[in-house]
Interface confidence: medium
């Protein structure tokens, strides 16, 4: 029950996280104009990964996509790529985890298969969350660097006739959404990995050692026998000398050249 709850909660948390990553990627407020020195202004600028927007004091907002620009810095392209990779991995993870949920029965899917799928989706969520956190952090670092460069330029008047009064930019809402969403996806992924351990069968029934008696000659069949705890269903695998009678496990094995001497 606890495993099902952990898996279900991991799924829900990851779902919320991935929805947040998608929202953050699409949002326009990745960076907003710093109004510290100019709290009352006719226009307010804010930017996202895909377009730049201007909001006038009247409330009228106009946005323009970056495809109209002459050049995009590699860092911005990298942030875009990280966010998209995060979304894609997260979406695949969600798809896999739906089939892995213990509360959903699909045909005769074994617990071991569900455990593997849960682990796969968990790892995908972890990587997805890390991609989102990395993307947002790279952008934030870029903003901080530009902010302090602008501040230095504002007071030193660097660069001759280059503008001395700078418009500086600070963290937008999308950055916080991205950090939280990435964190949630990461936590959801960890929960799925924990649930995987509980889903995996504690012991697997392997082919046991069996003997076939034919008169006085005894045949030994080397099989894929592995040491077990000595408890549970493995105790069924007994040595049988009743002239070819087979255990339940032995019925599943195929004849090989070692079956008869």
């Amino acid at each position: 029950m606890a495993v099902t709850a952990c898996q279900g909660l991991g799924f829900v948390v990851s779902l919320i996280g991935i929805a947040g990553i998608i929202a953050a990627t699409c949002m326009d407020q990745w960076s907003t104009q710093d109004l510290y020195n100019n709290p009352v202004t006719a226009v307010f600028n804010y930017q996202g990964l895909w377009r730049s927007c201007v909001r006038e004091s009247s409330g009228f907002t106009e946005c323009r996509g970056y495809f109209t620009l002459l050049g995009l810095p590699a860092m911005l392209q990298a942030v875009r790529a990280l966010m998209i990779v995060g979304i894609v991995l997260g979406a695949i993870g969600l798809l896999v985890s739906i089939f892995a949920l213990k509360c959903i029965r699909i045909g005769s899917m074994e617990d071991s298969a569900k455990a593997n799928m849960t682990l796969t989706s968990g790892i995908m969520f972890i990587v997805s969350g890390l991609c989102a956190i990395a993307g947002v952090s790279v952008f934030a670092n870029m903003l901080v660097t530009n902010f302090w460069m602008s501040t230095a330029n504002m007071y030193t008047g660097m660069g001759g006739m280059v503008q001395t009064v700078q418009t500086r930019y600070t963290f937008g809402a999308a950055l916080f959404v991205g950090w939280v969403a990435g964190g949630l996806t990461l936590i959801g992924g960890v929960m799925m990995c924990i649930a995987c351990r509980g889903l995996a069968p504690e012991e697997t029934n392997y082919k046991a050692v069996s003997y076939h008696a034919s008169g006085h000659s005894v045949a030994y069949k080397p099989g894929g026998f592995k040491a077990s705890t000595g408890f549970g269903s493995n105790t069924k695998n007994k040595k049988i000398y009743d002239g070819g009678a087979r255990t339940e496990d032995e019925v599943q094995s195929y004849p090989s050249k070692h079956d008869y001497v």
Epitope: V43, Q47, S52, L69, L70, L76, N146, M158, Q166, T167
Partner: nanobody
Framework: QVQLVESGGGSVQAGGSLSLSCAAS????????MAWFRQGPGKEREVVAT????????YYTDSVKGRFTISRDADKNRVYLQMDSLKPEDTAMYYC??????????????????????WGQGTRVTVSS
């Protein structure tokens, strides 16, 4: 609203220099991206150089790289275009343009004329061989 007035145009011999100036007035807070465009006789209007309102690198079209320099003086609300080693093919009407959009992380200002909301009347530059 932003008003732009260009000055500094004229006639010059090939290899000579000219300095164009663009004075912005009105709500200059709008003018984030500033650019110089030109339109030669029988040609399309093309971007020459652009500059951001922040601490970012300017952009130059390939044909003027190393010869032209764009700069901006925010205190005087002016944008300049220093043109050196002029060629006859630089003969055109030069326009100053302002765009109210800004791009904070090193994105170069746009070079599509349709994006620029505010335009000056233009100043003529003639380079004779």
């Amino acid at each position: 609203q932003v008003q732009l007035v260009e000055s500094g145009g004229g006639s010059v011999q090939a290899g000579g220099s000219l300095s164009l100036s663009c004075a912005a007035s009105g709500d200059t807070f709008h003018s984030k991206c500033m650019a110089w465009f030109r339109q030669g006789p029988g040609k399309e209007r093309e971007v020459v150089a652009t500059i951001q309102s922040g601490y970012y690198r300017p952009y130059y079209t390939d044909s003027v790289k190393g010869r032209f320099t764009i700069s901006r003086d925010a205190d005087k609300n002016r944008v300049y275009l220093q043109m050196d080693s002029l060629k006859p093919e630089d003969t055109a009407m030069y326009y100053c343009a302002a765009d109210r959009f800004t791009y904070p992380y090193g994105v170069i200002c746009g070079g599509i004329s349709a994006n620029y909301r505010y335009w000056g009347q233009g100043t003529r530059v003639t380079v004779s061989s």
